[in-house]
């Protein structure tokens, strides 16, 4: 339905505290280096002309499209230029390359300082006195860092986020109620951040039909006594609300989801038993609850899918005649009845049942050609089951911290290339999959570990996109986005790297590390232990274990030295000198 | 979890008929597919006949339809196998297993439980 003015119909259906909110969020995602004040600014003259058109949607350029209105207001940044450099010729193109163009200079990791959180008493302070602009800066500081975060749900973050404040800076400990919840919000957001850059890397690097087979397999497992057409329906509108997303249409996108998450609770009995209670919650709270909601049961019959896709004489026909439907209810079918399959397993297989028809359809007896089709799912439902069970099995033996340092050096020696801070990142948030998934039970480890999996090896996708220094991460990243992880699981030690010439600078310490946390000391030595094995690729676990033992005890002994800057100088030589002949540098 | 323990094997002429029995013990079965396979001397394992959670589909191997019947009762925790016309073919050690998630029924791969096996031979 056309709308005269469409920037005064998201200012009607969105109310101004979320319109101005999501205008903060769109502004910070695209000029991510600008000044908090200097997008306040531009975000409080969109508003002010968005008044103006819902008082009288006639007025000028109220007919304007959203794309114009922001990129022009973009685009009277006095410093476009200097701060971004080639960005600033977007602003000679016209809608609807001039978005493109900005949306290509997203920046996945973007040159800011890392935040540090101030003291209790400070933020507590700062929210008693402007609290309106405080969860301003939230916004804007959290839009920046993460250009792809799913607006809608930072929308509710700093819901969650203002609460937390509101409830613990009148508390008698403000640090002890305060301090967890905002941990707890920091790893949240990062991951929630992490899954929307997984759905926006699907939908515009491999398209919308990869998205909405993916979005096919996971609603049709959560979702498995919905028919498939109401499955499909849920599909087309969530591709919506995400191609709007990942394309910075936030008005239309958060408008859009409050539209979807309606439909499912005035639906939910042909949908799901479970939603009940996320159906009761405030639009905020619903839609997150919804989209968190756990799988329902499964009927309680469900025939073999052999009679429809293997034994029927049917099957090439209703194939031809609507390939992507037939397969659609394929993957629906199967994955109403895998709940512990992950949904890149079930897209392998649905992949590999296309594969057969489409080489099947075209012999002399096609029958005859995809009868046994499924006996080429096994080895593909074993790899990840198998791959996951001694992963496991590492993990409970090692623990976290060295279970990391495994994947660590397994990774380094995969795509030594890679810069060491994205190797450890992403290293370790592998490692997290341990305490994450292999305390599930079986039926539950798979959809768990491989899905996160894919996650996390598209932040390595993304990052590497930035700078490409590794044809084999720009191999497994664009090939198939399905077969990402199977492709890295599959990588051997790169024969072709040159070991990275010997700095001592490198493996130099000083006393500053006896302050910080233990997930930044870990993080010190996770970087060491990466260039590690970027000067000694061939180095065994045995030797690095060796070096890493005594790289812990001289920071241990460091630490607890009168005079700890002469110790880490002195000590320091040492530990290098006799790294590297144990090394054999 | 489920155990699987299977009788009612043993030794039958051509033509004839036997009736094996899986009991379970442990986790109620109506939210197991369940299903018998086979195992021939020398041979891989191969799929015979499943039956859905409640009874309602049930689903063979082209080699023993209209001879064999699989049925289940879940308030007795049991599945039975009807086998009827037997042929020295059939002659193997049979297996129950019980999966709670399948697609196909027929793959051994989406079963999570297994019995020991009884042994069917058929013979003149």
């Known amino acids: 339905d056309a709308h005269k003015s469409e920037v005064a119909h998201r200012f009607k259906d969105l109310g101004e505290e979320n319109f101005k909110a999501l205008v903060l969020i769109a502004f910070a995602q695209y000029l991510q280096q600008c000044p908090f004040e200097d997008h306040v600014k531009l975000v409080n003259e969109v508003t002010e002309f968005a008044k103006t058109c819902v008082a009288d949607e006639s007025a000028e350029n109220c007919d304007k499209s959203l794309h114009t209105l922001f990129g022009d207001k973009l685009c009277t940044v006095a410093t476009l230029r200097e701060t971004y450099g080639e960005m600033a010729d977007c602003c000679a193109k016209q809608e609807p390359e001039r978005n493109e163009c900005f949306l290509q200079h997203k920046d996945d990791n973007p040159n800011l300082p890392r935040l540090v959180r101030p003291e209790v008493d400070v933020m507590c302070t700062a929210f008693h006195d402007n609290e309106e602009t405080f969860l301003k800066k939230y916004l804007y500081e959290i839009a920046r860092r993460h250009p792809y975060f799913y607006a809608p749900e930072l929308l509710f973050f700093a819901k969650r986020y203002k609460a937390a404040f509101t409830e613990c800076c009148q508390a008698a400990d403000k640090a002890a109620c305060l301090l967890p919840k905002l941990d707890e919000l920091r790893d949240e957001g990062k991951a929630s951040s992490a899954k929307q850059r997984l759905k926006c890397a699907s939908l515009q690097k491999f398209g919308e039909r990869a998205f909405k087979a993916w979005a096919v397999a996971r609603l049709s497992q959560r979702f498995p006594k919905a028919e498939f057409a109401e499955v499909s329906k849920l599909v087309t509108d969530l591709t919506k609300v995400h191609t709007e997303c990942c394309h910075g249409d936030l008005l239309e996108c958060a408008d859009d989801r409050a539209d979807l998450a309606k439909y499912i609770c005035e639906n939910q009995d042909s949908i799901s038993s479970k939603l009940k209670e996320c159906c009761e919650k405030p639009l905020l709270e619903k839609s997150h609850c919804i989209a968190e909601v756990e799988n329902d049961e499964m009927p309680a019959d469900l025939p073999s899918l052999a009679a429809d896709f293997v034994e029927s004489k049917d099957v090439c026909k209703n194939y031809a005649e609507a390939k992507d439907v037939f397969l659609g209810m394929f993957l629906y079918e199967y994955a109403r009845r895998h709940p512990d399959y992950s949904v890149v397993l079930l897209l392998r297989l649905a992949k590999t049942y296309e594969t057969t028809l489409e080489k099947c359809c075209a012999a002399a007896d096609p029958h005859e050609c995809y009868a046994k089709v499924f006996d080429e799912f096994k080895p593909l439902v074993e790899e990840p089951q198998n791959l996951i069970k001694q992963n496991c099995e590492l993990f409970e033996q090692l623990g976290e911290y060295k279970f990391q340092n495994a994947l660590l050096v397994r990774y380094t020696k995969k795509v030594p290339q890679v810069s060491t801070p994205t190797l450890v990142e992403v290293s370790r948030n592998l490692g997290k999959v341990g305490s994450k998934c292999c305390k599930h039970p079986e039926a539950k480890r798979m959809p768990c570990a491989e899905d996160y999996l894919s996650v996390v090896l598209n932040q390595l996708c993304v990052l590497h996109e930035k700078t490409p220094v590794s044809d084999r991460v720009t191999k497994c990243c664009t090939e198939s986005l399905v077969n990402r992880r199977p492709c890295f699981s599959a990588l051997e030690v790169d024969e072709t790297y040159v070991p990275k010439e010997f700095n001592a600078e490198t493996f130099t310490f000083h006393a500053d590390i006896c302050t910080l946390s233990e997930k930044e000391r870990q993080i010190k030595k996770q970087t060491a232990l990466v260039e590690l094995v970027k000067h000694k690729p061939k180095a065994t676990k045995e030797q690095l274990k060796a070096v890493m033992d005594d790289f812990a005890a001289f920071v241990e002994k460091c630490c607890k030295a009168d005079d700890k800057e002469t110790c880490f100088a002195e000590e320091g030589k040492k530990l290098v000198a006799a790294s590297q002949a144990a090394l054999g540098l | 979890d489920v155990q699987l323990v299977e009788s009612g094997g043993g030794v039958v002429q051509p033509g004839g008929s036997l009736r094996l029995s899986c009991a379970a013990s442990g986790s109620t079965i109506s939210s197991y597919v369940m299903g018998w396979f086979r195992q021939a001397p020398g041979k891989e394992r191969e799929f015979v006949a499943a039956?859905?959670?409640?009874?309602?589909?049930?689903y063979y191997a082209d080699s023993v339809k209209g001879r064999f019947t699989i049925s289940r009762d879940n308030s007795k925790k049991t599945v039975y196998l009807q086998m009827n016309s037997l042929r020295p073919e059939d002659t193997a050690l049979y297996y129950c297993?019980?999966?709670?998630?399948?697609?196909?029924?027929?793959?051994?791969?989406?079963?999570?439980?297994w019995g020991q096996g009884t042994l069917v031979t058929v013979s003149s």
């Open positions: 297993a019980a999966g709670r998630y399948s697609a196909w029924y027929s793959q051994s791969y989406e079963y999570d439980y």
């Open positions: 039956i859905s959670r409640s009874g309602g589909y049930t």
